[in-house]
């Protein structure tokens, strides 16, 4: 039938092209100061000089020239706290999401030369300075080493490290991805006397093995200890080393709380409170009970003691503990009391002040919105972000609570700064919040500014993306709306990206972009020029993103609705939204598609297989197809265990494969990278097998040697070009 293409007319501005997106033509910049004191910071300039800035004296100078950086091909740096040395990082080699190895060189700023003798081994898995002076801790071949000074020989702290078996000071795969969200698992005490670290023992974990084809005659096999749902998990132990005697005395193990140690458990985070006080957080394998344990160094025993009366239990009765992760405490100056975000009695995540017991916690914020992150606690102020302002869950503003006052007074620092341009902020504070940088991500062009921590006065614009603003002047950008729709007693926020010169009386094809994972959020007031922006701008497609049940920052009732039944409400709510969009009158109901990546690939697959007839076609990139195939920490957090006496039935019912027959009446494009360490290719292989067995036609594309991000330049270009062709064909749009 004739194509109904929307063509913008009578405008000198041009539409976005796919090439614009693939070339990153319209990418924005942010500016995060690398704070080195209350009023000083470093920043890497456009031409790769490392520049020192003093806010108060207004002085700035190059502390490390780009020629020194180039001499070792450095791409990153780190200044020692005594300002005598800089480490230069080069030969960056990515491993998993956060982890990478690199070569490190130490540059002596006093002498203006590289430190020779006892050079660091290569490649190093992690390296960091002590918080005071210039001690170095690093991880090499899964063991931790310590240098008292950069030119000194190293002391080996751990000896148990073994590839794919025992990891010291760095997480294994599952902890990196699903628990810590870091490449490191070691933490210096504030005075640099102690070094805490985690040992992960993966000896009993099953291995995921996949082929990496490379260029050789034979592919090589990648082996990763990867616990899938219900499998054996890593065994974790936390140790603390006294760096005064790293050679003489072995690391001291920190005891695990009894109520945690009685069954399978996780370590979730470590926070130094003071030079001889540390706070550890633990989580039961069934992730609805978290224990925060405060431990003290006992000089007389030379050991760490964690008294029972310093254990604080956080429990969820409606779902899992915490949001995506259990929140971490922000300790006050007294090193005893702390502020922490957890659910209040109404199920909204808010800041609480804990002095002795969780039962006696004082609620600091309240309302039908959520506190999201505590940035800094000082003597008289607490800075945090929330989505309170004007009731939009997808906004982020920064607030200050004056805790010196009684009762504490609250001020929104960002709400009225650049109200139209900026509704989604993060912040970066100097040590005691004397100054801070605000980074606004949208909805307008991102802008980074510097502020006085006492008056909140703007001191300077650090980055305002002027070049981007100029280059967008002649581009027809789509219009972005963030609104809510109601269905029964539920409210769903959505973002709609409308083609330029959108006309409500016309009919447009609709593409739903979905993620939908527990505690995620897609409807955010942020700036973006990406593939879907192009689809709206050039191809006249309406794009919608909907935050259904299970998504974050709207209370536990909404969040925990999906607990133990993934794949039900997330899909249902996308379908509900599509029906509501059709009712709006400008959607061509014959041309509706859905696409998603990762969890979004799972939801889009289930939506296509819902049997509703709403979708003509859809794309799943790197989808999960069964929660039994995914990582234990993630799957079990939301689904429990895949055992008969727990939740095996829903594990089986919620697979994509179980719906194979229902793909018969949709056009399905299935895409996966063969070297996906996260959502294994196995997931798509099983979908494909089920579709073949059901004799259902579908399209597929694999990306050889690509991981979960399919991010290599060539692959990404191919991927988006391929998906564009598929969509245009589905929507009968001419090339």
């Amino acid at each position: 039938r004739p194509s109904r293409v929307y063509k913008p007319e009578g405008n000198t501005k041009r539409a976005l092209t796919l090439k614009d997106i693939l070339n990153g033509t319209f990418s924005y910049k942010t500016y995060f100061p690398n704070w080195i004191s209350e009023q000083e910071y470093l920043h890497q300039s456009e031409d790769d000089n490392i520049v020192f800035y003093n806010i108060e004296t207004r002085e700035s100078y190059i502390i490390l020239s780009n020629s020194t950086m180039k001499s070792v091909n450095a791409t990153d740096y780190g200044l020692s706290p005594d300002r005598q040395f800089v480490y230069l990082e080069s030969d960056y080699s990515k491993l998993w999401r956060y982890s990478y190895t690199a070569t490190y060189y130490i540059y002596d700023l006093q002498n203006g030369e590289f430190v020779r003798g006892y050079e660091l081994p290569r490649p190093i898995q992690y390296l960091c300075w002590s918080p005071v002076g210039s001690k170095l801790a690093y991880v090499y071949q899964n063991n931790i080493y310590l240098k008292q000074r950069p030119g000194d020989p190293p002391f080996q702290i751990t000896y148990t490290g073994r590839e794919n078996r025992i990891f010291n000071g760095i997480p294994d795969w599952v902890y990196e991805e699903e628990m810590l969200a870091t490449k490191y698992a070691l933490w210096w005490s504030p005075d640099g006397k102690f070094l805490a670290y985690v040992e992960f023992n993966d000896s009993d974990i099953p291995i995921i093995a996949y082929s990496y084809y490379g260029d050789g005659q034979y592919p090589r096999t990648i082996n990763i200890p990867y616990p899938k749902a219900g499998a054996k998990n890593p065994v974790v132990r936390v140790f603390i080393v006294d760096t005064t005697y790293p050679h003489h005395v072995g690391p001291m193990e920190v005891p695990v709380p009894e109520m945690i140690a009685s069954s399978d458990y996780y370590f979730s985070w470590l926070t130094w409170v003071s030079s001889e006080r540390v706070c550890l957080q633990w989580l039961k394998r069934v992730q609805n009970v978290s224990v925060l344990s405060i431990c003290d160094f006992r000089e007389d025993w030379h050991a760490w003691e964690c008294p029972k009366n310093q254990e604080h239990v956080e429990e969820s009765r409606t779902g899992w503990a915490g949001g995506f992760f259990v929140s971490t405490p922000a300790f006050s100056q007294d090193a005893t009391s702390y502020y922490k975000i957890f659910s209040d009695k109404d199920g909204y995540k808010h800041i609480h002040y804990i002095k002795d017991t969780v039962e006696n916690a004082i609620q600091i914020t309240s309302g039908k919105w959520e506190a999201i992150y505590i940035f800094r606690v000082t003597q008289d102020s607490l800075f945090y972000s929330s989505n309170e302002f004007e009731g939009y869950p997808g906004r982020r503003n920064i607030y200050r609570i004056s805790i010196g006052n009684s009762p504490p007074s609250k001020k929104c620092v960002t709400c009225h700064l650049r109200k139209e341009r900026c509704q989604y902020y993060t912040a970066s504070f100097s040590y005691k919040a004397k100054y801070y940088a605000l980074v606004c991500y949208g909805p307008g062009l991102p802008i980074s500014t510097l502020h006085d921590g006492r008056t909140d006065q703007e001191i300077q614009v650090l980055e305002e993306n002027k070049e981007l603003e100029n280059s967008l002047r002649n581009i027809q950008l789509p219009k972005v709306e963030i609104k809510k729709l109601k269905d029964g007693g539920l409210t769903f926020w959505y973002k709609m990206i409308l083609p330029p010169q959108f006309d409500r009386s016309k009919k447009y094809p609709l593409l739903i972009q979905v993620y939908g994972g527990p505690c995620s959020q897609s409807v955010k007031s942020v700036f973006a020029v990406n593939w879907i922006t192009y689809l709206a701008s050039k191809e006249g497609i309406v794009i919608a993103l909907v935050d259904g049940r299970g998504t974050a920052f709207q209370g536990d009732k909404f969040l925990h609705a999906v607990y133990r039944k993934l794949g039900v409400y997330e899909v249902e709510d996308q379908l509900t939204a599509v029906r509501k969009f059709i009712e709006m009158g400008f959607i061509d109901e014959e041309r509706i598609a859905i696409w998603g990546w990762s969890y979004g690939g799972y939801v889009s697959s289930l939506a296509l297989a819902s049997g509703t007839g709403l979708f003509k076609c859809g794309i799943a990139v790197a989808p999960v197809s069964s929660w039994e195939y995914y990582a234990s920490i993630y799957s079990e957090r939301f689904m429990g265990l895949p055992t008969k006496d727990d939740n095996l039935e829903h594990y089986k019912n919620s697979t994509v494969m179980a719906r194979a027959e229902y793909f018969r009446n949709v056009d399905y494009l299935l895409i996966h990278g063969t070297a996906d360490d996260n959502v294994h290719f196995q997931n798509s292989a099983q979908i494909a097998k089920a579709l073949v067995n059901a004799q259902v036609d579908f399209q597929a594309m694999w990306y050889s040697d690509q991981n979960h991000g399919i991010s290599s330049g060539r692959s990404q270009n191919h991927l988006y070009t391929h998906m564009t062709h598929f969509l245009k064909q589905c929507f009968s749009l001419s090339d």
């Epitope: 000194d152 050679h247 003489h248 005395v249 072995g250 025993w301």
Partner: antibody, heavy 120, light 107 residues
Framework: QLQLQESGPGLVKPSETLSLTCTVS??????????WGWIRQPPGKGLEWIGS???????NYNPSLKSRVTISVDTSKNQFSLKLRSVTAADTAVYYC????????????WGQGTTVTVSS | EIVLTQSPATLSLSPGERATLSCRAS??????LAWYQQKPGQAPRLLIY???NRATGIPARFSGSGSGTDFTLTISSLEPEDFAVYYC?????????FGQGTKVEIK
């Protein structure tokens, strides 16, 4: 093969300073993975760790002896030394010098020991 | 400081017999425990490091086990040259300390 040899006077008067030297042969005292230490054993008794030194000169002492002990190193001579001030009869012991490979590998090379008697 | 208590003080056995020596710590020392052998008029010799690893050149009849507070040195079949005093040493706590020793004598 690494060897250690203690030397010094076998008799020291009370309140004086005991001085011993350990000579390292068959290897360098500047090895980055070793500390060099002193252990003593009073007659018919157990072993007591006195202290140790790194080739760079950094030292660690047993708190019970810290106020009286000094350990020093001379890398050019491949030697390290022990000084114990204000000795009493309770300091009479066999003194051993050792190579200390650290908390994990232990004290793997010992000198044969030298007897020091504190008596007037 | 950590106190290491060795038992028994004396063990009287015949060649070929199995010797089991115990070392108990006043608090956990993890696995940071070494065993030394000392013969009359000689310096001690390192036998076992990190609770269970044999030092270079030590015969397989010597084995170490345990972690936390309870450790054992086992000599599976006593040879004549094994009759000596055995010391355990902890490296978990500052300062490193030794046990008082167990004497293994010929019965």
């Amino acid at each position: 093969q690494l060897q250690l040899q203690e030397s010094g006077p076998g008799l020291v008067k009370p309140s004086e300073t005991l001085s011993l030297t350990c000579t390292v042969s068959g290897g360098s005292i500047s090895s980055s993975s070793s500390y060099w230490g002193w252990i003593r054993q009073p007659p018919g008794k157990g072993l007591e760790w006195i202290g140790s030194i790194y080739y760079s000169g950094s030292t660690n002492y047993n708190p019970s002896l810290k106020s009286r002990v000094t350990i020093s190193v001379d890398t050019s001579k491949n030697q390290f030394s022990l000084k114990l001030r204000s000795v009493t009869a309770a300091d009479t012991a066999v003194y051993y010098c050792v190579r200390d490979k650290g908390y994990y590998y232990g004290m793997d090379v010992w000198g044969q020991g030298t007897t020091v008697t504190v008596s007037s | 400081e950590i106190v290491l208590t060795q038992s028994p003080a004396t063990l009287s056995l015949s060649p070929g017999e199995r010797a089991t020596l115990s070392c108990r710590a006043s608090q956990s020392v993890s696995s940071y425990l070494a065993w030394y052998q000392q013969k009359p008029g000689q310096a001690p010799r390192l036998l076992i490091y990190d609770a269970s690893n044999r030092a270079t050149g030590i015969p397989a009849r010597f084995s170490g086990s345990g972690s936390g507070t309870d450790f054992t040195l086992t000599i599976s079949s006593l040879e004549p040259e094994d009759f000596a005093v055995y010391y355990c040493q902890q490296r978990s706590n500052w300062p490193p300390t030794f046990g008082q020793g167990t004497k293994v004598e010929i019965k």
